[in-house]
């Protein structure tokens, strides 16, 4: 008889990222025997749903279903038929949904409703669909990049397996930018986090961290960018908007009606004497730069300092893992260079902006152009937010490491929630047997 | 290179089923979406449905129950079923290629197509 | 279900000319929309996919632009071979739907 090989003791986990702007699928995959290790989880598959946040499904929530079959097709497909019944899913929606919670909790809820019926028609172990706070979703951020980077594992090693890694255990800080809200997270160096709102406390294999996060809802990109026109329309003579966000040429018709339909902009509302308003780019970094520092209140401040909006944040410490839009954008933009300083970032944006739209089509064609119209915008913005916002300097510039992936999985939120919500993090460090890491040999 | 090839009766009477086949060559059926859409003198491009790598079926439910796909992937074959045929059933019916691009979101694109089998529905 | 209204439904051009095929959708499709061309008794050729991306060996005088509920098609420098009817298809939704088609002669 033939001998059969035997079955791979792997196990398999599901996670969701329900964003503002697209939903995402991804698959986990570990030894079952080393679950408490660090560092062995890897992602193997991500399916981007097509189509847009689940928050935009309010006034159609029949079609949530199909909405997300694809993906979930998928993951039958890539997970073996039979790991299905025990594969955990997940699903966490992150500050779309707070939005229209804040809005609307019937309606959140009946969005998450049939997102939690569609997602249980699957073989899988469906676990349940909810929104994450934006603390939650600082913390499992910081969590992921630390635990693909080797940070919380006790061996040291006279090489390196992981980019970045600087063979010491000082966590990076977690900087997370998404389409409706930001997250910046980090250990601060012997520094009192004076507001509770902002500190964590986590003991993760044998060690205790005390963490600093925050998380600022409509300050994600899509949003802000939503903020500033609501602000800049404000002042305008007539429905023609000339922006320097947008490139040159590029025109734009926004109907105010959608500008005003997020809570983001209700601070910048007013009535309008038109329906419609076109956006004309004029192309310049400056005067957008100087457009989008209106965003940040820097007035106020009720602790020893603050980040923005009266937020308490303490001096920057360590290095910073910078992913989700911050890499997006940067890696567009083709800055994600260790090598290229602020400066340099600050001229090619300049040039950036300036460019012409005709031609930014021709240079870029194949590259969507609702993306391809914004990069003027968020890359601006980025600059923006960590220089003034967190107050990044020329000189701590070259401590953000823009990180699109580690180890092959994507820098997110979404392992780290899993790692957590499947025990897989242990308060204490695990009992080494003798070959648990002779990989290393 | 990539091929795919309908065949099909070309003559079905009004209320029978209409069966299609698609040879693929070029290409494996595990990798791939294999979409059906067809051309009739009514309604111009319609999409009918496909069936994905791993098997899974997604309908227009314009066809409601009257629909089905499945394949044999040993053979590299797909096939369309339709019944209750109507004479505005007539027209060309087409099997394509769609590659999913699961990281970008991107579905649906028919990047290669059959040659069609053209169907009259006629008593 | 999403309709797709093409315009004008068919045009007359000049060898050389510039063409433009305008396709609009009922609602936003983000960028999720392809563009086909069709010639008689032939099946009918991807040509843009994606809004504005041109699949391989297309000839680069075919160009897309455009997303959300507004898309075209442009041919610079029309040759004989462009002669066709070309279709717009989003695949945003099901069920994929398409637009009804221009036929595109020469003058």
């Known amino acids: 008889t033939q001998n059969k090989a035997l079955p791979e003791n792997v196990k398999y986990g599901i996670v969701l990222d329900a964003g503002s702007s697209h939903t995402s699928l991804y698959i986990y995959k570990w030894p079952a025997e080393k679950e408490n290790d660090t560092g062995v989880v890897h992602q193997v598959e991500e399916c981007r749903v097509k189509g847009p946040g689940i928050s935009k499904f309010v006034q159609k929530v029949n079609e949530i279903g199909i909405y997300l079959t694809d993906c979930m097709e998928r993951a039958r497909e890539v997970i073996p038929r039979s790991q299905h019944q025990e594969t955990p899913v997940y699903l966490g929606a992150t500050a779309g949904m707070r939005l229209l919670r804040m809005e609307s909790e019937e309606l959140a809820d009946r969005v998450l409703d049939v997102v939690e019926r569609s997602l249980s028609n699957y073989p899988f172990d469906f676990q349940g669909a909810r929104i994450i706070t934006g603390q939650e979703e600082g913390a499992y951020g910081w969590i992921t990049i630390n635990y693909l980077l080797g940070k919380f594992s006790q061996k040291t090693r006279w090489f390196s397996i992981v980019p970045y890694e600087t063979n010491n255990q000082e966590t990076f800080g977690a900087l997370d930018l998404g389409g409706a809200s930001t997250q910046v997270t980090f250990v601060p160096q012997n520094q009192t986090i004076e507001s509770p709102d902002n500190a964590l406390q986590f003991r993760l294999y044998g060690k205790d961290y005390n963490v600093y996060t925050h998380s600022f809802l409509c300050y994600g990109k899509d949003q802000a960018l939503w903020q500033k026109l609501a602000k800049d329309i404000q002042v305008a003579s007539n429905e023609i908007l000339r922006d320097p966000c947008f490139h040159p040429g590029y025109k734009k018709v926004v109907n105010v009606s959608d500008l005003y339909k997020t809570p983001c902009t209700k601070r910048f509302e007013m009535t309008l004497p038109f329906q419609q308003f076109e956006i004309q780019g004029i192309g310049n970094y400056q005067q957008c730069h100087q457009s989008i520092l209106e965003l940040f209140n820097t007035s106020y401040c009720p602790y020893s300092q603050c980040a923005f909006n009266g937020i308490f944040l303490p001096p920057l410490q360590g290095d910073f893992g910078a992913f989700s839009a911050f890499y997006f954008v940067m890696k567009f933009l083709n800055l994600t260079s260790e090598k290229v300083s602020q400066e340099k970032v600050t001229e090619m944006m300049k040039k950036f902006c300036a460019q012409p739209w005709e031609e930014i089509k021709t240079s870029y064609a194949g590259v969507k152009e609702k993306y391809l119209s914004e990069y003027c915008f968020s890359g601006t913005y980025i600059l923006s937010l960590l220089l003034q916002g967190y107050h990044f300097t020329a000189d701590s510039w070259e401590h953000i490491h823009f990180i699109g992936k580690i180890q092959g999985s994507d820098a997110g939120w979404t392992l780290g929630y899993m790692l957590n919500l499947t025990n897989m993090i242990p308060a204490e460090q695990p009992l080494s047997t003798p070959l648990s890491h002779s990989t290393y040999v | 290179q990539v091929q795919l090839k309908e065949t099909g009766p070309g003559l079905v009477q009004p209320t029978q089923t209409l069966s299609i086949t698609c040879t693929v060559s070029g290409f494996s059926l595990t990798s791939y979406f294999t979409q059906w859409v067809r051309q009739t003198p009514g309604k111009g491009l319609e999409w009918m449905g496909f069936i994905r790598s791993g098997g899974s079926t997604q309908y227009n439910s314009a066809f409601k129950s009257r629909l089905s796909i499945s394949r044999d992937t040993s053979k590299n074959q797909v096939f369309l079923k339709m019944n209750s045929l109507k004479t505005e059933d007539t027209g060309v019916y087409y099997c394509a290629r769609d590659r999913p691009d699961y990281h970008d979101g991107t579905y649906g694109v028919l990047d290669v197509w059959g040659q069609g089998a053209s169907v009259t529905v006629s008593s | 279900d999403i309709r797709m209204t093409q315009s004008p439904a068919s045009l007359s051009a000049s060898l050389g000319e510039t063409v433009n095929i305008e396709c609009l959708a009922s609602?936003?499709?983000?960028?999720?929309l392809a563009w086909y061309q069709k010639k008689p008794g032939k099946s009918p050729q991807l040509l843009i996919y994606?809004?504005?991306a041109l699949q391989n060996g297309v000839p680069s005088r075919f160009s897309g632009s455009g997303s959300g509920t507004h898309f075209s098609l442009k041919i610079n420098s029309l040759q004989s071979e462009d002669v066709a009817t070309y279709f717009c298809q989003q695949y945003i939704n099901y069920p994929y739907t398409f637009g009804g088609g221009t036929k595109l002669e020469l003058r």
């Open positions: 994606n809004g504005n």
């Open positions: 609602e936003d499709i983000d960028s999720d």
